[in-house]
Amino acid sequence: YDFTNCDFEKIKAAYLSTISKDLITYMSGTKSTEFNNTVSCSNRPHCLTEIQSLTFNPTAGCASLAKEMFAMKTKAALAIWCPGYSETQINATQAMKKARKSKVTTNKCLEQVSQLQGLWRRFNRPLLKQQ
């Protein structure tokens, strides 16, 4: 999906009002210095591309974050503020349902969410290019 035509300011508002708080809740009890950020992003479409991939793609040691509150709100924000996003995600949603029945927080998932926080912070930088 090409995130170029999203309403970035509306997504930013959704992040600041709720998604950021859900990420902090998920990370509660974890020191902010515990994980090194190894990925970043260049402009807002890039940030959303990486946020979407990191939030919804299973990775080694962290099968899925898709059922977490921050993930569901991220998906909703992208569906509302990115034209045509929902249509591209139908197959991905089916795969997510099969991939995971219950929520398990592993250290690798905490690390992954720490990376997500970094990507979201970069997305919100005032000087970051729209595209």
Partner: antibody
Framework: QVQLQESGPGLVKPSETLSLTCTVS?????????WSWIRQPPGKGLEWIGY???????SYNPSLKSRVTISRDTSKNQFSLKLSSVTAADTAVYYC??????????WGQGTLVTVSS | EIVLTQSPATLSLSPGERATLSCRAS??????LAWYQQKPGQAPRLLIY???SRATGIPARFSGSGSGTDFTLTISSLEPEDFAVYYC??????????FGQGTKVEIK
């Protein structure tokens, strides 16, 4: 300390597919960072080709996108480049590198690929 | 596509002298710029990222400055091992990361 090593044929015929592999040691490619390919034609500057991130997102240089495929084999800690329909203009030293998806902090030593019949 | 223009193409200096290399972007890249050093037959090495942050293990004689469209790499006092080609790279414009054409620092 992470080390990267490119491997693959040094000579490819025009119109064929160039295939290279980068073997990473000292760091798991599924643990963090992105894993990138960059090339440098003889005596010229650098051109970014693309990357695959540790979680599987892939990004390509738009000027090469139609011909490029980057993939990975986490069991071997390797990632690969395929460039189709090559011409003499694709003759270059090809580097693999570790990236934070912005800049490149560790590089392989490079491998020269010549496109010639 | 953002074009990076480096100047001069070649800089002829003696060890101990100060080297000032320029990189100009065709449009603003904020501080999203890196500098690399490349010696003959070797891979590039990251020196500076975010326009002014030194990469791990890079000596203090290397410094970067600038923002927007004009950037400078300064080597305060050239050591013999500093004679090489230097490239700037912008990462403001995904998915079109681009490099400058390079500046060669040679022994006078």
């Amino acid at each position: 300390q992470v080390q990267l090593q490119e491997s693959g044929p040094g000579l490819v015929k025009p119109s064929e597919t160039l295939s290279l592999t980068c073997t990473v040691s000292g760091y798991s490619i599924s643990s963090g960072y992105g894993w990138s390919w960059i090339r440098q034609p003889p005596g010229k500057g650098l051109e970014w080709i693309g990357y695959i991130s540790y979680y599987g997102s892939i990004s390509y240089n738009p000027s090469l996108k139609s011909r490029v495929t980057i993939s990975r084999d986490t069991s071997k800690n390797q990632f690969s480049l395929k460039l189709s329909s090559v011409t003499a203009a694709d003759t270059a030293v090809y580097y693999c590198a570790r990236t934070n998806l912005l800049y490149f902090d560790s590089w392989g030593q490079g491998t020269l690929v010549t496109v010639s019949s | 596509e953002i074009v990076l223009t480096q100047s001069p193409a070649t800089l002829s200096l003696s060890p101990g002298e100060r080297a000032t290399l320029s990189c100009r972007a065709s449009q603003s890249v904020s501080n999203n710029l890196a500098w690399y050093q490349q010696k003959p037959g070797q891979a590039p090495r990251l020196l500076i990222y975010d326009a002014s942050s030194r990469a791990t293990g890079i000596p203090a004689r290397f410094s970067g400055s600038g923002s927007g469209t004009d950037f400078t790499l300064t080597i305060s006092s050239l050591e013999p091992e500093d004679f090489a080609v230097y490239y700037c790279q912008q990462y403001s414009d995904w998915p079109q990361y681009t490099f400058g054409q390079g500046t060669k620092v040679e022994i006078k």
